[in-house]
Interface confidence: low
């Protein structure tokens, strides 16, 4: 592993990214670490403003983390001779409250991209797809991690959260490749609609750690390939039948419900049997209700008929509450 | 069903050379980066080599760096480990085995393997 | 490289009872939200089979009283109960990093 030594001496390496000259074969950033043998570039903690223009053609991991980059802007890696093995890109933590559309344009190798524990006040519709069009080139992207990427309040846009997050994932239908989603601890309150239906290669989507009261408004029933669904730690209060049937229908994958609230009345009864019965649940055992107070921590699989029930609705002049 | 078929071991002398090949069927090999992977007599597994599903990315493990060469022929879905420089240590059953993803998966299928013995 | 230890060498659990292998690595193999940890089973005369893959994720079509956990250094593979056919050499595998390395293996034998 080599450690960079470069100075404002190697001026010339940064002049415009896409015209900068072709970095020497062992060249290593300022303050970043370099691995030839191992592909690697870790540029970490250095409270970086800015994507180095010097990064080495053999790159294929490259570490961006702890950093204060703040802005990505259009071709924020573009290259010449582009950084055509750059396959793991991961901008952590970086202070990031803004990507712009085609940030990501000319990495061809790029399968798995980390934008996590960045407050994301404006992500691009077109930072993955690169391109406004309807239908753009398709994203070279597997694996896409975006857990943690909420901003504060105050720097929130006008628009919803979730809605500007789904624009970018269905822009030009360029992630139909992708296999695993991570969208963990977004306060999420609910899943735009249309978003998994762009999503058909999905294997690994995890929503956990959200804020989402139900699903009744998405659909799985495309997600054919789907292996792990992540709805722990949400606002869960019960599954409908639509959506218990769409994922006994998906033939590989493993559900992860814990930690959601579960309201134990007259309409957990289709989910309680459909417990009973499915091996989709991964540790169902565990699953217990919230609501209402007589039933709280009472395991969902130990239920029966008898113990769902709902309050007869009182008329207007009898309700106290 | 998917089905990964080696080929190619039996004996050889120390310096000598072998390539062993794994032929893929029932899944579309092009979409798949591909390891050998070898276990030598009672013991245990030790990672020999990586390629790319495009062939454009090679790892090799430093017992068998500079002579082993890993590649792959994605018409004719096969895989290829080409030895030279054996050793008495190489001796081993060497398995192909395919990864999903690039990093984070384990190898999700493995051939059944084929047995070189380096020996005089 | 890192080095992944297994514990025990050996163990024998009997029928319908719980077997737990541990498998420590030299190293983080864990990334803020995944870990690059799976484990194998390899019967006599046969290749090995991938039960588990990143810690916890149980690979299609294997039996679900298989099951992982843990991040970081520490891992460990649980099977619960434990069956006559589980016989056979269990394996941790990291792919943190290259070279991929493989534990020295856990043999299981059913009591």
């Known amino acids: 592993t080599s450690s960079a030594s470069s100075s404002s001496s190697s001026a010339p390496f940064l002049a415009s990214a896409a015209s900068a000259q072709p970095p020497l074969p062992d060249q290593c950033p300022a303050l970043c670490e370099c691995s030839e043998a191992a592909r690697t570039v870790k540029c970490v903690n250095r409270n970086l403003t800015e994507v180095p223009t010097d990064l080495p053609l053999y790159v294929r991991n490259l570490f961006l983390t702890g950093n204060q980059l703040a802005v990505l802007p259009a071709g924020a890696f573009a290259r010449r001779p582009p950084l055509a093995e750059l396959a793991a890109l991961n901008l952590s933590g970086s202070r990031l409250d803004e990507v712009r559309g085609g940030a990501f344009e000319h990495l061809p190798s790029l399968r798995q991209l980390d934008l996590s524990h960045n407050p994301l006040a404006y992500l691009s519709p077109f930072a993955f797809s690169g391109s406004n069009a309807s239908i753009s080139a398709p994203s070279p992207l597997v694996e896409l991690i975006l857990n943690h990427i909420v901003p504060p309040d105050d720097k929130r846009q006008n628009r919803s959260f979730e809605g500007m997050v789904a624009a970018a994932l269905v822009a030009g239908r360029a992630l139909q490749g992708l296999h695993l989603l991570e969208l963990a601890s977004n306060h999420f309150l609910y899943l735009p609609r249309d978003v998994l239906a762009q999503l058909p290669s999905l294997r690994y989507l995890d929503l956990s750690n959200n804020s989402l009261v139900s699903l009744t408004y998405v659909s799985f029933r495309n997600l054919t390939h789907l292996e792990s669904l992540h709805l722990e730690d949400n606002a869960l209060k019960v599954l409908h039948n639509g959506t218990l049937a769409e994922l006994q229908g998906l033939p590989h994958v493993r559900v992860f419900l814990d930690n959601n609230p579960w309201v134990c009345d007259c309409h957990m009864a289709d989910m309680v049997t459909w417990l009973k019965q499915t091996g989709v649940v991964q540790g169902k055992d565990r699953l217990t209700c919230a609501f209402p107070e007589k039933m709280r921590n009472r395991v969902l699989l130990e239920l029966n008929s008898a113990d769902l029930d709902c309050d007869p609705i009182l008329p207007p002049s009898l309700q106290t509450s | 069903d998917v089905q990964l078929v080696e080929s190619g071991g039996g004996l050889v002398q120390p310096g000598g050379s072998r390539k062993l090949s794994c032929t893929a069927s029932?899944?579309?090999?092009?979409?798949?980066?591909m390891h050998w992977v070898r276990q030598a007599p009672e013991t245990g597994l030790e990672w020999v080599a990586y390629?790319?599903?495009?062939?454009?990315?090679?790892y090799y493990a430093d017992s068998v760096k500079g002579r082993f060469t890993i590649s792959r022929d994605n018409p004719k879905n096969t895989l290829f480990l080409q030895m030279t420089s054996l050793r008495s240590e190489d001796t081993a059953m060497y398995f192909c085995a395919r990864s999903p993803a690039y990093y984070r998966y384990g190898l999700d299928y493995w051939g059944q393997g084929t047995t070189l013995t380096v020996s005089s | 490289d890192i080095v992944l230890t297994q514990s025990p060498a050996s163990l024998a659990v009997s029928l319908g009872q719980r077997a737990t292998i541990s498998c420590r690595a030299s190293?983080?193999?864990?990334?803020?939200?995944?870990?690059?940890m799976h484990w194998y089973q390899q019967k006599p005369g046969q290749p090995p089979k991938l039960l588990i893959k990143?810690?916890?994720n149980l690979e299609s079509g294997v039996p679900a009283r298989f099951s992982g956990s843990g991040s970081g250094t520490d891992f460990t593979l649980n099977i619960h109960p434990v069956e006559e056919e589980d016989t056979a050499t269990y394996y941790c595998?990291?792919?943190?990093?290259?070279?991929?390395?493989f534990g020295g293996g856990t043999k299981l034998e059913i009591k």
């Open positions: 029932g899944f579309t090999f092009s979409n798949f980066g």
């Open positions: 190293q983080s193999v864990s990334s803020s939200t995944f870990s690059y």
């Open positions: 390629i790319s599903s495009g062939s454009s990315t090679f």
């Open positions: 595998q990291h792919s943190w990093e290259i070279p991929y390395t």
């Open positions: 990143s810690s916890s």
